[in-house]
Interface confidence: low
């Protein structure tokens, strides 16, 4: 638990609290924007992103986007507000502690996206079907 005297934010945003009224700290996420990747045909991959960022706003979560087309594979790692769409998709799994990739329909490419809310959770992106949303652990909301 966060001691009550600790200041919440790294910026001047409105104080954000969780459902229990506890102050919510900004998330720590991998944040390398778009980088070329060698992650292909694997159950899980590390992001190979060396930049860990404090998200600008306390409500933001970690996001990873894996894209493959005829020319290359890229992996995008960012912070994003789950109330807003990203690449035109809603972040349905933002409360998950793990980044479980789900395929999205995008013409001309294979497109997977995941979001999660534990520190640096978008460093390990998981494609394996053994992780799925029927696992109650993945639905736990992480209160920082």
């Amino acid at each position: 638990t966060i001691p009550p005297h600790v200041q919440k934010s790294v910026n001047n945003d409105m104080i954000v609290t969780d459902n229990n009224g506890a102050v919510k700290f900004p998330q720590l996420c991998k944040f390398c924007d778009v980088r070329f990747s060698t992650c292909d045909n694997q159950k899980s991959c590390m992001s190979n992103c060396s930049i860990t960022s404090i998200c600008e706003k306390p409500q933001e979560v970690c996001v990873a986007v894996w894209r493959k087309n005829d020319e290359n594979i890229t992996l995008e790692t960012v912070c994003h507000d789950p109330k807003l769409p990203y690449h035109d998709f809603i972040l349905e799994d933002a409360a998950s502690p793990k980044c479980i990739m789900k395929e999205k329909k995008k013409p001309g490419e294979t497109f997977f996206m995941c979001s999660c809310s534990s520190d640096e959770c978008n460093d390990n992106i998981i494609f394996s079907e053994e992780y799925n949303t029927s696992n109650p652990d993945l639905l736990l909301v992480i209160f920082q």
């Epitope: 720590l28 944040f31 390398c32 930049i51 960022s53 404090i54 600008e56 520190d119 640096e120």
Partner: antibody, heavy 121, light 107 residues
Framework: QVQLVESGGGLVQPGGSLRLSCAVS????????MSWVRQAPGKGLEWVSA????????DNTDSVKGRFSISRDNSKNTLYLQMNSLRAEDTAVYFC??????????????WGQGTLVTVSS | DIQMTQSPSSLSASVGDRVTITCRAS??????LNWYQQKPGKAPKLLIY???SLQSGVPSRFSGSGSGTDFTLTISSLQPEDFATYYC?????????FGQGTKVEIK
């Protein structure tokens, strides 16, 4: 007032060991990655080691791998660098530095005043 | 590892001069480039991060520019307290690496 104060430097013989400490105040230590950066006399800056905020991940420059170990005690707001099998080329001022990362941009700020390690027989 | 090369290694200038220091990366680092100032016997001090963002408390005569592999630190009007050594540093990939430094001396 953010402060980083290094200690533990000194003269040591080749093959010897030293443990550096960096006492931190003025910010919430447990939420930041930390690094050690060194500077040989009259030379430039060289990153040595880093540790994640929780302490579960570490990384070292190739020249110190297997010899140096970075650690932290978040309850004591202190960063450590255990240096074993010291060599003459490890002689340098060792700085601890707070790692900052916002919106994908990261940098070292602020830095401690440094502690001198001299490896000589 | 990404190599960072600064030029010149040293320069002599007078108070009021405009000073430019360049830093080149061995591969593209986007805008993941920081500049530090170090005075003798002191710790480095962050001046510019993310290639062009001025760190809080740093005088506006310092500015940074560049992207990809080529970067510049400019001091628009050199002041007596600016005589120091300046280092660039990439934060694009591990290990973070520094340039060899540029010493700015009084002419």
């Amino acid at each position: 007032q953010v402060q980083l104060v290094e200690s533990g430097g000194g003269l040591v013989q080749p093959g010897g060991s030293l443990r550096l400490s960096c006492a931190v105040s003025g910010f919430e230590f447990r939420r930041y990655a930390m690094s050690w950066v060194r500077q040989a006399p009259g030379k430039g800056l060289e990153w040595v080691s880093a540790i994640s905020a929780s302490g579960d991940r570490t990384d070292n420059t190739d020249s110190v791998k297997g010899r140096f170990s970075i650690s932290r005690d978040n309850s004591k707001n202190t960063l450590y660098l255990q240096m074993n099998s010291l060599r003459a080329e490890d002689t340098a001022v060792y700085f601890c530095a707070k790692g900052i990362a916002r919106s994908g941009k990261n940098f070292f700020d602020p830095w401690g005043q440094g502690t001198l390690v001299t490896v000589s027989s | 590892d990404i190599q960072m090369t600064q030029s010149p290694s040293s320069l002599s200038a007078s108070v009021g001069d405009r000073v430019t220091i360049t830093c080149r990366a061995s591969q593209s680092i986007s805008s993941y480039l920081n500049w530090y100032q170090q005075k003798p016997g002191k710790a480095p001090k962050l001046l510019i991060y993310a290639a062009s963002s001025l760190q809080s408390g740093v005088p506006s005569r310092f500015s940074g520019s560049g992207s990809g592999t080529d970067f510049t630190l400019t001091i628009s009007s050199l002041q007596p307290e600016d005589f120091a050594t300046y280092y660039c540093q990439q934060s694009y990939s591990t290990p973070p690496t520094f340039g060899q430094g540029t010493k700015v001396e009084i002419k």
